[in-house]
């Protein structure tokens, strides 16, 4: 399954939108930094494309879920959020098309499930952090910065997979 070139452009647009969503000066938020334990090893280059597609799908689905809450809607600009949802939705569609084609359905299912679980736990930690910080503006900015970093790392994996073909 070949992800369309528009998928890469969509990923870049997603990062640009995340950058534009910033609402406050980040310099006041230093002390709110937190170690969310991004499972970077689940996005390592050792994975085959068959194994990464469902993990990338889970990552984007979780980002979508995180920013679709009412707390998120209160924190961010509505117009930018709508554009953000649209980009994520398109990327989910691209990845789902690959999953439907049967890529990796029979390959290393346990490894895949472990990776998906690690991604889910990562987002649970993010959600818990936001709750503990009472969804403060700084907490949301820390989360936005974290998502930009983790999304960028997962996007880099997509690019490396494409270049290996």
């Amino acid at each position: 399954c070949d992800l369309p070139q528009t998928h890469s452009l969509g990923s870049r647009r997603t990062l640009m939108l995340l950058a534009q969503m910033r609402r406050i000066s980040l310099f006041s938020c230093l002390k709110d930094r937190h170690d969310f334990g991004f499972p970077q090893e689940e996005f390592g280059n050792q994975f085959q494309k068959a194994e990464t597609i469902p993990v990338l799908h889970e990552m984007i689905q979780q980002i979508f879920n995180l920013f679709s809450t009412k707390d998120s809607s209160a924190a961010w600009d509505e117009t930018l959020l709508d554009k953000f949802y649209t980009e994520l939705y398109q990327q989910l569609n691209d990845l789902e098309a690959c999953v439907i084609q049967g890529v990796g359905v029979t390959e290393t299912p346990l490894m895949k499930e472990d990776s998906i679980l690690a991604v889910r736990k990562y987002f649970q930690r993010i959600t818990l952090y936001l709750k503990e910080k009472k969804y403060s503006p700084c907490a949301w900015e820390v989360v936005r910065a974290e998502i930009m970093r983790s999304f960028s790392l997962s996007t880099n994996l997509q690019e490396s997979l494409r270049s290996k073909e």
Partner: antibody
Framework: EVQLVQSGAEVKKPGESLKISCKGS????????IGWVRQMPGKGLEWMGI????????AYSPSFQGQVTISADKSISTAYLQWSSLKASDTAMYYC??????????????WGQGTLVTVSS | DIQMTQSPSSLSASVGDRVTITCRAS??????LNWYQQKPGKAPKLLIY???SLQSGVPSRFSGSGSGTDFTLTISSLQPEDFATYYC?????????FGQGTKVEIK
């Protein structure tokens, strides 16, 4: 390879203006902040200020607020430190260093080689 | 502003010695504390970040500990290349501040 390359040493007279630079390479320049640190001869490190190159937001130490200006041009991955009117007390080594912003990552993990500024009449 | 106070300001030690440098913050900074090493004519080098995390490429003889207001940098067995000046720095809030430095000299 991550690198921060600073402009060369400067010798200036009191009252003159100056702009020194710090060019980042080997990483996404807008994903990190750039901080500036002063070290006067034989003295310790003093944090001057910082810039977020993604939108040029800045923060200054109260000691340096109004004395210097920090700026950046993300199109050429370069941060700047400038003075409009130098004083003899500005004689020092100036370092730039990158900061991960709000990400949980090492602070000031890469430094420039330093720019020596000498102000003398 | 958060003041950072290092002690001692200088110390003399021999190769193989265990060396401890302390840093105290004027208010709690959680674990937002970094340690740097600087040699004459060179830029500072990050050794420890977030109080106890060893920076990539730094020898394991360097370690950091502490939280809140009191922090320690330990060199378990001093090597010839470790003679330098060491600085702590808080990254809890702006303005960022450094300790005054501790010079480690050869005895």
């Amino acid at each position: 390879e991550v690198q921060l390359v600073q402009s060369g040493a400067e010798v200036k007279k009191p009252g003159e203006s100056l702009k020194i630079s710090c060019k980042g390479s080997g990483y996404s320049f807008t994903s990190y902040w750039i901080g500036w640190v002063r070290q006067m001869p034989g003295k310790g490190l003093e944090w001057m200020g910082i810039i977020d190159p993604s939108d040029s937001d800045t923060a200054y130490s109260p000691s340096f607020q109004g004395q210097v200006t920090i700026s950046a041009d993300k199109s050429i991955s370069t941060a700047y430190l400038q003075w409009s009117s130098l004083k003899a007390s500005d004689t020092a080594m100036y370092y730039c260093a990158r900061h991960p912003g709000l990400n949980w990552a090492p602070d000031f993990d890469y430094w420039g080689q330093g720019t020596l500024v000498t102000v003398s009449s | 502003d958060i003041q950072m106070t290092q002690s001692p300001s200088s110390l003399s030690a021999s190769v193989g010695d265990r060396v401890t440098i302390t840093c105290r913050a004027s208010q709690s900074i959680a674990d937002f504390l970094n340690w740097y090493q600087q040699k004459p004519g060179k830029a500072p080098k990050l050794l420890i970040y977030f109080a106890s995390s060893l920076q990539s490429g730094v020898p394991s003889r360097f370690s950091g500990s502490g939280s809140g207001t009191d922090f320690t940098l330990t060199i378990s067995s001093l090597q010839p290349e470790d003679f330098a000046t060491y600085y702590c720095q808080q990254s809890h809030s702006f303005p960022l501040t450094f300790g005054q430095g501790t010079k480690v000299e050869i005895k």
